[in-house]
Amino acid sequence: QLPPGKPEIFKCRSPNKETFTCWWRPGTDGGLPTNYSLTYHREGETLMHECPDYITGGPNSCHFGKQYTSMWRTYVMMVNATNQMGSSFSDELYVDVTYIVQPDPPLELTVEVKQPEDRKPYLWMKWSPPTLIDLKTGWFTLLYEIRLKPEKAAEWETHFAGQQTEFKILSLHPGQKYLVQVRCKPDHGYWSAWSPATFIQIPSDFIMND
């Protein structure tokens, strides 16, 4: 029977700069029941605080709700593991909420084949930003990426859409059924997961772009 091994805070993520969650990996348990607690202070502060919510983020997590989240502060946090034989502490992690944003995927992806009379046909897609992100505040610039592939293909074709919420693709294989997905990321932060796939059947008479 031993004191617990050193835990590690391995990830902090925020969906929108208004809340965030951090997760840790326990070290070895030393063969005894082990309690974990996360403490933090904000840079420039010496008041030590305890994790306000160990439930919302699941096991081995600390969730900071709206009232605990400040974009303008760096959080300095540490996890303490304690059993009957002693304690161990994780390294301190410095967290700036601005840099840990991982949005939800974009919403309402719609895909259509457009066949104008005077131009080459194309695939047109549009989507909406995730609901938790308020782009009107100016705090966010969201960038988008699209990927698509024929249903049975292994490789995805990826296109960067910048800040646009619509996109055209000209080069497609006629008669194929395509999967299309979109994801987003803030200018500082992480890519969201890909949106659920939208399927589109490309007509057999679709004319390939030269």
């Epitope: 008041l47 030590m48 900071f64 303008w72």
Partner: antibody, heavy 118, light 107 residues
Framework: EVQLVESGGDLVQPGESLRLSCTAS????????MNWVRQAPGKGLEWVSY????????YYVDSVKGRFTISRDNAKKSLYLQMNSLRADDTALYYC???????????WGQGTMVTVSS | DIQMTQSPSSLSASVGDRVTITCRAS??????LAWFQQKPGKVPELLIS???TLQSGVPSRFSGSGSGTYFTLTISSLQPEDIATYYC?????????FGGGTKVEIK
Amino acid sequence: EVQLVESGGDLVQPGESLRLSCTASGFTFNSYEMNWVRQAPGKGLEWVSYISSSGGTKYYVDSVKGRFTISRDNAKKSLYLQMNSLRADDTALYYCARLNGVDVFDIWGQGTMVTVSS
Amino acid sequence: DIQMTQSPSSLSASVGDRVTITCRASQDIFNYLAWFQQKPGKVPELLISAASTLQSGVPSRFSGSGSGTYFTLTISSLQPEDIATYYCQRYNSAPLTFGGGTKVEIK
């Protein structure tokens, strides 16, 4: 409605003890850090003591260290201040105050009066 | 311990006047500063946090500024209901010190 209600204030003699209570309602008490702040008659505000959400961390102003003890019972949604060896200069209206998530006193009780006099 | 010095300790101004109260910290407290209003016989109320963030429901004639060691609370156009004592308070470390207060009266 978010509310804090203090009780336990009284007239006591120097050297005596008193226990103040503060009962919370309308919010998740065990998620918030709590404080006692006092105000002597006709004077300004003075922070007295802080307690973290689980009760593991406590701070005191120098003038009450070793005499006052802050505690909480999250199951009862209650905050306490045990005041021993009371002195005349402890005479004040004692407020309990909630510290919000970014460390500001956002909710205050109405206060309970402690008078220390012989 | 960090001391908070407020000035003036009292002031008298006319309705509509611009009123400025200052608060100095004896050491750098970044912008960990709050302002409270306490009306006679009432409980203190939070006006401003983080030196300049107006709390919801507080009239826009109140504003806060400053960082480091020097802070101000400004009432752009004094109203009769603003008669109160105003306190600054730092909250970056214990003790969570208040300034001595500024009593605002109407001429």
